[in-house]
Structures are given as structure tokens and as C-alpha cells.
């Protein structure tokens, strides 16, 4: 139920990558506005994105307070000219989101190979440790600091002259691999959270190759 000139939000969807978290919904408003509330299972509701005509709301600031908590959001619909108006039950029309646990569900962003350095028949490949919006003691944590050994990187590498790939893994951000002297290699990495059952893997990083313009070592 609700007022005749408002419709409830629907298709409430969490879009989250490396903890940057936005709630999206439908429909595009016609003569109505929205306000979003978010809470943990045991917490109080906090209002965000007041009386907006957007159909998304950035809730990152709230979820990064504790990424292991489970959050619920709801979207209230109000008539555009009369935000005090309520539905027939005496409160505004609203719709609940699915529950969302950032630590378990945020998508892993595409990783980046920061550098590679060859010494003899060894190559050290370093994956950039991306900074997240999760804070601790006033400083932003990196992805590795948030996930610890729960985050693994898989390296794919192959000779530029051949199609046969090899793989290695690390629960740090560095690989040390054996290569054939005088051969150029290409590299790509993928992030994985082994303990998850969904959203376990990132997309592959861009491919980086030895002997190309970027050089053997990049900051």
C-alpha cells in the first residue's frame, strides 16, 4: 500500500568493488524522491542520500566502519512536493535491500602488476596493493591489510614466443619465478579469496611483458 502518487523502489542491488559500495534501485523517479537508510542487524537506522532523485546511493562510508558486519538498507519513496506524506499505514513507502556482508561479497577489483625485475634466471613480479576506503586508526587500509592471507594472487606467465602458460600463487603480493635466460615473458595476475563461495575471483590484470617499453622494472 502507499500514496497514490508514489511507487516503492524495487530491484535494490548492491554494487561493490574493493569495498567501494553503492546501493542501486529502480525506478527512475517521476514526481517522487528517495531517502536511503542503512543499519547493521543489531544497529540503528542511519539515513543517507536525503530526498534524492538519484537511483543510487554511495554507502561506502557506512560499510567500511566494519566490513565483517552484515548490513541491510531500505529505500523510502516520497512524493516530490510533499516529503511529509506517508502511506496508508502511516509511514512512507519503502523497500528492503538484500543483506550485504562486505568482507564476503565485495567484488575484487582488477589487479595491476606494479613491477617486474629480472635477476639472472629469476623474475620478481610485484602486484600493486590497492588502497581501499576501509580505515583503521585514521589511515586507509590496503586490500592485503584487510584480507591478510585470505587473499591469494595467481600469476599466469608464458614465454612471449610460446602459448604454453605456467602458473604460480602467493598469499603476499610478490612472486619469485624461474625463467629461461634470454627469453621474454608475459605476465597476468588474478586475485582470489579462497574462503568464499561467490565473488571469489577478480578479472585478470592487464598483461605486462618483459622487453617492452615499460621496461624491466616499473615503480
Amino acid at each position: 500500500s502507499g500514496t497514490t502518487n508514489t511507487v516503492a523502489a524495487y530491484n535494490l542491488t548492491w554494487k561493490s568493488t574493493n569495498f567501494k559500495t553503492i546501493l542501486e534501485w529502480e525506478p527512475k523517479p517521476v514526481n517522487q524522491v528517495y531517502t536511503v537508510q542503512i543499519s547493521t542487524k543489531s544497529g540503528d537506522w542511519k539515513s543517507k542520500c536525503f530526498y534524492t532523485t538519484d537511483t543510487e546511493c554511495d554507502l561506502t562510508d557506512e560499510i567500511v566502519k566494519d566490513v565483517k558486519q552484515t548490513y541491510l538498507a531500505r529505500v523510502f519513496s516520497y512524493p516530490a512536493g510533499n516529503v511529509e506524506s506517508t502511506g496508508s499505514a502511516g509511514e512512507p513507502l519503502y523497500e528492503n535491500s538484500p543483506e550485504f556482508t562486505p568482507y564476503l561479497e565485495t567484488n575484487l577489483g582488477q589487479p595491476t602488476i606494479q613491477s617486474f625485475e629480472q635477476v639472472g634466471t629469476k623474475v620478481n613480479v610485484t602486484v600493486e596493493d590497492e588502497r581501499t576506503l576501509v580505515r583503521k586508526n585514521g589511515t586507509f587500509l590496503t586490500l592485503r591489510q584487510v584480507f591478510g592471507k585470505d587473499l591469494i594472487y595467481t600469476l599466469y606467465y608464458w614465454k612471449s614466443s610460446s602459448s604454453g602458460k605456467k602458473t604460480a600463487k602467493t598469499n603476499t603480493n610478490e612472486f619469485l619465478i624461474d625463467v629461461d635466460k634470454g627469453e621474454n615473458y608475459c605476465f597476468s595476475v588474478q586475485a582470489v579469496i579462497p574462503s568464499r563461495t561467490v565473488n571469489r575471483k577478480s578479472t585478470d590484470s592487464p598483461v605486462e611483458c618483459m622487453g617492452q617499453e615499460k621496461g624491466e622494472f616499473r615503480e
Epitope: 591469494i152 595467481t154 599466469y156 602458460k165 605456467k166 602458473t167 604460480a168 600463487k169 602467493t170 619465478i177 588474478q190 582470489v192 579462497p194 574462503s195 563461495t197 561467490v198 571469489r200 575471483k201 578479472t203 585478470d204
Partner: antibody, heavy 117, light 107 residues
Framework: QVQLVESGGGVVQPGRSLRLSCKAS????????MHWVRQAPGKGLEWIGL????????IYDPKFQGRFTISADNSKNTLFLQMDSLRPEDTAVYYC??????????WGQGTPVTVSS | DIQMTQSPSSLSASVGDRVTITCKAS??????LNWYQQKPGKAPKLLIY???SLADGVPSRFSGSGSGTDYTFTISSLQPEDIATYYC?????????FGQGTKLEIT
């Protein structure tokens, strides 16, 4: 619950081909790395290779590269092992396994392949 | 490629005995080592992962230790149901390699 069921094994003549299937249920194969492992009669376990079904990346033990091909059909949640130019020494039980990146947590029951004239 | 040397290849022990199996890698595998138990006609079953972590539902008499190139699997008190073949597996880099296996029998 998670289950892997291999099929397609049997008796095949040397030089011929065979395609094994591994049907997964209880999870999406594209969320995991998937492997093939074999075991010859009375022998140890031997790793063949892996696939990331999400992007098609495949890695093989060099001894199987070129003769064996791993593929996946995500819409059917099924893994495949195409084996060409089969030899008597390829006689083995072939297993598929799911990899969570720290360990192979689920294995199929295995499908036997006999290469004999 | 990384070679895994597992020993002994067979082992006979009595119920209640402490049993130890070792795997030596040809280079540092950074604890990416698992131990599996296989009974005849069955698929392998995970016992230990990341060298020292006990898999879910596995009895605490099984344990693993080691780092670098040297790894050990221990059954603190052998039980009749532990009769099986045990394999180590390195999965730090491809090609992944299994040890040759240790067949455990009860005297």
C-alpha cells in the same frame, strides 16, 4: 551439495581420441579453478592440468601439452578433457577436482580409461 | 619443474604407533603443500592443507609441519581405518606435482 561426476571413460584403441566430461553440481565451475588428475593402475596420482572456466585460461603439465585439451562449458557447468593420440600408458582412472586455491576440496569418483588394441 | 620426493614408499606399523611421512621439494614451495589419503577404489581425501592446517572433519591425530622444502605428515596414534596410501601435493607453481605415495599397512 557439491558433487563432481565424471563420464566418458571406456576402452579405446591406441591412436584414437576420447573426450571425458565432469558434470558439477552444487556450485558454479566458473567461480573456481578446475583440474584433471589421473592414476594409472597400481601407480600414484599424476596432475594433468587446470582451467579457469571464467576466462578459459588453461595450464598443463608439459608432458600433456598438445595432446590433451581441457575446456569447460559454463552454461552446462561441465568440464571436459579431450585426449588425442592415446597410448597404452594413458590407461588410468581420470579424476576431476575443484580447487579453492589452497587445496582440492572436492573430487569426482573417477572414470576409467583403457587404451588397448 | 618442482620434484617432490616422498618417503618411505611403504610403511608397516601397529595400532597406536606414531607414524611419520616426509616430502622434500626440489625448491621452496612456500607451504603450498597438501596431504591426501586415498583408499582403494576411492578418490583422494584432503587431510592437511597449507602444510599445517587440518581440513574440516579430519581427526586431530593427523597433523602436518614444515616450510621451505621439507614437510612432514604425522599420525600420532595409528588407527585401523588409517590403512591407505598417502600423497603430498605441491601446488605453489605449475606443473603441480604429487609425491610418489606412501602405502601404510598395519602389522
Amino acid at each position: 551439495q557439491v558433487q563432481l561426476v565424471e563420464s566418458g571413460g571406456g576402452v579405446v584403441q591406441p591412436g584414437r581420441s576420447l573426450r571425458l566430461s565432469c558434470k558439477a553440481s552444487g556450485f558454479n565451475i566458473k567461480d573456481y579453478y578446475m583440474h584433471w588428475v589421473r592414476q594409472a593402475p597400481g601407480k600414484g596420482l599424476e596432475w594433468i592440468g587446470l582451467i579457469d572456466p571464467e576466462n578459459g585460461n588453461t595450464i598443463y603439465d608439459p608432458k600433456f601439452q598438445g595432446r590433451f585439451t581441457i575446456s569447460a562449458d559454463n552454461s552446462k557447468n561441465t568440464l571436459f578433457l579431450q585426449m588425442d593420440s592415446l597410448r597404452p600408458e594413458d590407461t588410468a582412472v581420470y579424476y576431476c577436482a575443484r580447487d579453492n586455491s589452497y587445496y582440492f576440496d572436492y573430487w569426482g569418483q573417477g572414470t576409467p580409461v583403457t587404451v588397448s588394441s | 619443474d618442482i620434484q617432490m620426493t616422498q618417503s618411505p614408499s611403504s610403511l608397516s606399523a601397529s595400532v597406536g604407533d606414531r607414524v611419520t611421512i616426509t616430502c622434500k621439494a626440489s625448491q621452496d614451495i612456500r607451504k603450498y603443500l597438501n596431504w591426501y589419503q586415498q583408499k582403494p577404489g576411492k578418490a583422494p581425501k584432503l587431510l592437511i592443507y597449507y602444510a599445517t592446517s587440518l581440513a574440516d572433519g579430519v581427526p586431530s591425530r593427523f597433523s602436518g609441519s614444515g616450510s621451505g622444502t621439507d614437510y612432514t605428515f604425522t599420525i600420532s596414534s595409528l588407527q585401523p581405518e588409517d590403512i591407505a596410501t598417502y600423497y603430498c601435493l605441491q601446488h605453489g607453481e605449475s606443473p603441480y606435482t604429487f609425491g610418489q605415495g606412501t602405502k601404510l599397512e598395519i602389522t
